[in-house]
């Protein structure tokens, strides 16, 4: 059973507060507070397993540890999706699955995790040092990607443990912009709450929770974010590429990676069948990209004939790989 970081549920605003703060100033702090609480860093974990029966057969499992709703999952190999990787499968939480050789069976395991079985025969079959990546588009977090591969000396039947590790990538301006808005909002919220604290609050019912409790919760750094300041993992350069597919060209712009491992308590544990020896995790990273995604099932707005579901500097078709996007 794997443990997931839970975002605490927010209580609705107390009726007694309306007299103290007024209806107008009441709504904004709670909206901002919700943003602050849900602005915690989500994580993506990836687990790669080589089957003991077929040496070149792999099973990839990926999961999303976040409070948002997943709108699309893209599994790729040979590197991150949109950075030279080739799409293996695309999974939509309502509309289904599209998959590509050598993928044999992609499926949803839970509402926030997927698995993909890869065939072990043929020219396009994976090899032991292939990097597999999972990209989760979610609302409101945006797009998060993690990659992983088997350790070089792993025995058949063993798997690399699930390896989440948050990193920043891509559209910095957008990320900083959103972060700035959130930071400003949170500071403003703190200011409002401080101001409210110095005002006499009439008839606050003792049984109810005061807004200070959620505030403390919102601002307390999570284990994950505290732990995300230790030794970085190394990013893999994979020498094993898909043999039969045309791989997308790498990004033209600078590609930089700042990998940060995640606290072990947040490392999801798979079921007994996935139990693995403590192999050091390697080549795992997560990226957040600018742009918020529509709720699952909603059609993204058209931006012209070359719409892609994810932003990509190389043009409309480069990101999607085998998926044809109108």
């Amino acid at each position: 059973m794997r443990t997931e970081a839970q975002v605490p549920a927010l209580q609705p605003p107390e009726p007694g507060l309306e007299g103290a703060m007024g209806h107008r100033t009441l709504v904004l702090p709670w909206v901002l507070l919700t943003l602050c609480v849900t602005a915690g860093t989500p994580e993506v974990w990836v687990q790669v397993r080589m089957e003991a029966t077929e040496l070149s057969s792999f099973t990839i499992r990926c999961g999303f540890l976040g409070s948002g709703s997943i709108s699309l999952v893209t599994v790729s190999w040979g590197g991150p999706n949109g950075a030279g990787g080739t799409t293996l499968a695309v999974l939509h939480p309502e509309r289904g699955i599209r998959q590509w050789a050598p993928a044999r069976q992609a499926r949803w395991e839970t509402q926030s995790s997927i698995s993909l079985i890869l065939e072990g025969s043929g020219a396009s079959s994976p090899c032991a040092n292939t990097t597999f990546c999972c990209k989760f588009a979610s609302f409101p977090e945006g797009s998060w990607e993690a990659c992983g591969s088997l350790p070089p000396s792993s025995d058949p039947g063993l798997s690399a443990p699930p390896t989440p590790a948050p990193i920043l990538r891509a559209d910095l301006a957008g990320i900083l912009g959103v972060s700035g808005v959130l930071l400003f909002g949170c500071v403003y919220l703190l200011h409002l709450l401080r101001r409210h604290k110095h005002r006499p609050a009439p008839r606050l019912q003792p049984s109810r929770t005061s807004p200070q409790a959620p505030r403390a919760r919102a601002w307390a750094p999570s284990q994950a974010s505290q732990a995300a300041l230790h030794v970085p993992y190394a990013t893999i350069n994979t020498s094993c590429r898909p043999a039969t597919l045309d791989t997308a060209h790498p990004h033209g712009g600078p590609s930089w990676w700042a990998s940060l491992p995640t606290h072990a308590a947040h490392r999801p544990q798979g079921p007994a069948a996935w139990a693995s020896t403590p192999i050091p995790a390697r080549g795992s990273f997560v990226s957040v990209e600018n742009g918020l995604y529509a709720q699952a099932g909603e059609r993204p707005p058209h931006t012209g004939p070359g719409l892609t579901l994810f932003p990509d500097p190389r043009g409309p078709r480069a990101m999607e790989g085998p998926l044809g996007v109108r």
């Epitope: 309502e94 509309r95 289904g96 599209r98 499926r107 099932g297 078709r317 044809g324 996007v325």
Partner: antibody, heavy 119, light 107 residues
Framework: EVQLQQSGPELVKPGSSVKISCKAS????????LDWMKQSHGSSLEWIGA????????SYNQKFKGKATLTVDKSSSTAYMELRSLTSEDSAVYYC????????????WGTGTTVTVSS | DIVMTQSQKFMSTSVGDRVSITCKAS??????VDWYQQKSGQSPKALIY???TRHTGVPDRFTGSGSGTDFTLTIDNVQSEDLAEYFC?????????FGGGTKLEIK
């Protein structure tokens, strides 16, 4: 107007191979996947596989692996399906269909190609 | 493989009537179900996708509903041009599978 024009009917001998085509027009060929379906006389449809004209990636129904091979010629906006080791079981109408990956469905279907396997 | 069952092979109706064609999936497929119409001697045409969204140009007398395992295509005010065979398709899992089809006959 978006169209998928398929090649004409084929009468072939058992054990031989046949290659049928699906020529796309009215849209950017590489922007959409093309899938293939089989409809045997008096029975339902079966999904054979999918092809990405963009990069040549394929996906097959396990039942048709070794039977069907999907290829593409970007220069002529044409997708092909080759059927080999034909038997009477392969006699059917074969359709190509365009997959709309925004809305996830087959929005346009080809005209269909009738393949008859007979000695 | 996911089995899509259209229990009624044939349905008879009159012009102006309302008819419901059902499709049952052997496992949960969320809303990953489409409906296609095929008139005699023609290629299939898209009617409904994502269980309930009408394809462009499809008359609003065609309505799709359901999610999970049970899906229904309802035709209100049936017209003579609706004489056709109707197929459901699931694309929740590989391989994609079609229902056996329901032929609509006009009395």
């Amino acid at each position: 107007e978006v169209q998928l024009q398929q090649s004409g009917p084929e009468l072939v001998k058992p054990g031989s191979s046949v290659k049928i085509s699906c020529k796309a027009s009215g849209y950017t060929f590489t922007d959409y996947n093309l899938d293939w379906m089989k409809q045997s006389h008096g029975s339902s449809l079966e999904w054979i596989g999918a092809m990405s004209p963009n990069n040549g990636a394929t996906s097959y129904n396990q039942k048709f692996k070794g039977k069907a091979t999907l290829t593409v010629d970007k220069s002529s906006s044409t997708a092909y399906m080759e059927l080999r080791s034909l038997t009477s079981e392969d006699s059917a109408v074969y359709y190509c269909a365009r997959w709309d990956s925004n809305s996830w469905y087959f929005d346009v279907w080809g005209t269909g190609t009738t393949v008859t396997v007979s000695s | 493989d996911i089995v899509m069952t259209q229990s009624q092979k044939f349905m008879s109706t009159s012009v102006g009537d309302r008819v419901s064609i059902t499709c049952k999936a052997s496992q949960i497929v969320r809303t990953a179900v489409d409906w296609y119409q095929q008139k005699s001697g023609q290629s299939p045409k898209a009617l409904i996708y994502s269980a309930s969204t009408r394809h462009t140009g499809v008359p609003d007398r065609f309505t799709g509903s359901g999610s999970g395992t049970d899906f229904t295509l309802t035709i209100d005010n049936v017209q003579s041009e609706d004489l056709a065979e109707y197929f459901c398709l699931q694309h929740w899992n590989y391989p994609y599978t079609f229902g056996g089809g329901t032929k609509l006959e006009i009395k």
